[in-house]
Interface confidence: medium
C-alpha cells in the first residue's frame, strides 16, 4: 500500500484531472463489510437511502454494491495500488442511479441520486491494504477516507502512514 505522501501526491494529481467522462474499466458487484465483519447496508426511507453499519446474522441477506473501477490518467511512480503504474478509482452504487458521495463539509458519507457524468465527490481512490482489505480515499480531499464512526459511515482524516491500516477505514469486499 502507498505511504501517505504517495497517497496525497496521487490524489492531488487526480484532483487536477477530470475522469468523469471516462467509462469504467471493469465493474464488480460485491457486499461491503467492515474489518470487524459488520455489514454496510442501505435502506430506502422517504425516497432517499440511508446507510447503516449492522451486525447481520448468517441468514440475513447482505446488500450488494456495484463498484465501477476507473484508471487515473497519471502514471504512478510508486508500487502498490497502481495498475500498470496508474491509480485505481472507484464509484460505489448500491442501487440504480444512487452513488456514495463524500460530503467534506459535514465529514459524512451520503447517497445521492445523480446522472452521469458523476461529480468528483462520487470518486474514491482505491487502496489495497493488508488482509484482503481495501480503503477508499476521497478524490476531492487527499488524506480523507471513508470510515466507520458510531455505527455509521463517515469521512475520517488520516494524517500518517501508520494510520492507513487503522481498522475503522478498512473494508472487505465479498461476492457472497
Amino acid at each position: 500500500a502507498f505511504g501517505i505522501s504517495g497517497v496525497q501526491k496521487y490524489t492531488r494529481a487526480l484532483h487536477d484531472s477530470s475522469i468523469t467522462g471516462i467509462s469504467p474499466i471493469t465493474e464488480y458487484l460485491a457486499s461491503l463489510s467492515t474489518y470487524n465483519d459488520q455489514s454496510i447496508t442501505f435502506a430506502l426511507e422517504d425516497e432517499s437511502y440511508e446507510i447503516y453499519v449492522e451486525d447481520l446474522k448468517k441468514d440475513e441477506k447482505k446488500d450488494k454494491v456495484l463498484l465501477s473501477y476507473y484508471e487515473s490518467q497519471h502514471p504512478s511512480n510508486e508500487s502498490g495500488d497502481g495498475v500498470d503504474g496508474k491509480m485505481l478509482m472507484v464509484t460505489l452504487s448500491p442501487t440504480k442511479d444512487f452513488w456514495l458521495h463524500a460530503n467534506n463539509k459535514e465529514h459524512s458519507v451520503e447517497l445521492h441520486k445523480c446522472e452521469k457524468p458523476l461529480p468528483d465527490q462520487a470518486f474514491f481512490v482505491l487502496h489495497n491494504m493488508h488482509s484482503n482489505c481495501v480503503s477508499f480515499e476521497c478524490k476531492t480531499d487527499p488524506g480523507v477516507f471513508i470510515g466507520v464512526k458510531d455505527n455509521h459511515l463517515a469521512l475520517i482524516k488520516v494524517d500518517s502512514s501508520e494510520n492507513l491500516c487503522t481498522e475503522n477505514i478498512l473494508f472487505k469486499l465479498s461476492e457472497t
Partner: antibody
Framework: EVQLVESGGDLVQPGRSLKLSCVTS????????MTWIRQVPGKGLEWVAS????????YYPDSVKGRFTISRDNSENTLYLQMNSLRSEDTATYYC??????????????WGQGTLVTVSS | DIQLTQSPSTLAASLGERVTISCRAS??????LIWFQQKPDGTIKRLIY???TLESGVPSRFSGSGSGTDYSLSISSLESEDFAMYYC?????????FGGGTKLELR
C-alpha cells in the same frame, strides 16, 4: 448490545384495555420486523402479533384478531401492543422479540424479559 | 395451521449425557425451524435457526438437524446450565406456531 425492555403489564378486569410498550436499543430498529409473543403461566409460547419494519403491514392469529393492535414508532425505537376487550385467557407474560430483517433472515434472535398481564375480576 | 409436535415433553438426563429432542411438523416447513431455550427465570434464547445454523455464542455441543417435517435438537454432552425448557418454532407459514416444549431435567 441489543436490548428489548417491555413495560405496561398490569392486573386488569375482563373487557378492559391495556397498552404494552417495548423500548429497544443496540440495533437499527427501523430495519427489522417486530413481534409480540405470549406465555400463559406454566404453559407454552404463542405468537400474538407481528409488524413489518415500516409498520405498513400487521399480522395476527385468530385468537387476538380484532382485539389486539400492534404498532411501532420508528423515531422512538419503540414497539406497542394495544389490547382491547381483554379476556381471562389473555393472562400471560408478553414478550417482544426482534423479528426478521426487512429483506431476509429468520426471526426472534433477541427477546425482552417479558411483562405480566393478568386479566381477572 | 401447521402443528408442531415436540417430544418428549419431559426428559430426565445426567451430566455428560447426549440427549435429543424431536419436533415434527404437520406439513413440510422447508428448514424454517428455530430452537429456543427458556431458563426458569423466563429468559429466552435462540439456539438454532434455519433448522441447523448455530447462533453465534451458543456452545458447539448444541446442534440441529432435519428436513421436511422431522427435526431434532441434540446436546452432545450435558452441562449443568443446559437443564431448562426447550421449544421449537416454525416460521414457514403464518400463523407461526411453537411446539409444546420439552422440559430437560437432571436425573
Amino acid at each position: 448490545e441489543v436490548q428489548l425492555v417491555e413495560s405496561g403489564g398490569d392486573l386488569v378486569q375482563p373487557g378492559r384495555s391495556l397498552k404494552l410498550s417495548c423500548v429497544t436499543s443496540g440495533f437499527i430498529f427501523k430495519n427489522y420486523w417486530m413481534t409480540w409473543i405470549r406465555q400463559v403461566p406454566g404453559k407454552g409460547l404463542e405468537w400474538v402479533a407481528s409488524i413489518t419494519n415500516t409498520g405498513g403491514a400487521t399480522y395476527y392469529p385468530d385468537s387476538v384478531k380484532g382485539r389486539f393492535t400492534i404498532s411501532r414508532d420508528n423515531s422512538e425505537n419503540t414497539l406497542y401492543l394495544q389490547m382491547n376487550s381483554l379476556r381471562s385467557e389473555d393472562t400471560a407474560t408478553y414478550y417482544c422479540a426482534r423479528d426478521r430483517r426487512y429483506n431476509s433472515g429468520s426471526p426472534f434472535a433477541y427477546w425482552g424479559q417479558g411483562t405480566l398481564v393478568t386479566v381477572s375480576s | 395451521d401447521i402443528q408442531l409436535t415436540q417430544s418428549p415433553s419431559t426428559l430426565a438426563a445426567s451430566l455428560g449425557e447426549r440427549v435429543t429432542i424431536s419436533c415434527r411438523a404437520s406439513q413440510s416447513i422447508s428448514n424454517s425451524l428455530i430452537w429456543f431455550q427458556q431458563k426458569p427465570d423466563g429468559t429466552i434464547k435462540r439456539l438454532i435457526y434455519s433448522s441447523s445454523t448455530l447462533e453465534s455464542g451458543v456452545p458447539s455441543r448444541f446442534s440441529g438437524s432435519g428436513s421436511g417435517t422431522d427435526y431434532s435438537l441434540s446436546i452432545s454432552s450435558l452441562e449443568s446450565e443446559d437443564f431448562a425448557m426447550y421449544y421449537c418454532l416454525q416460521y414457514a407459514t403464518y400463523p407461526w406456531t411453537f411446539g409444546g416444549g420439552t422440559k430437560l431435567e437432571l436425573r
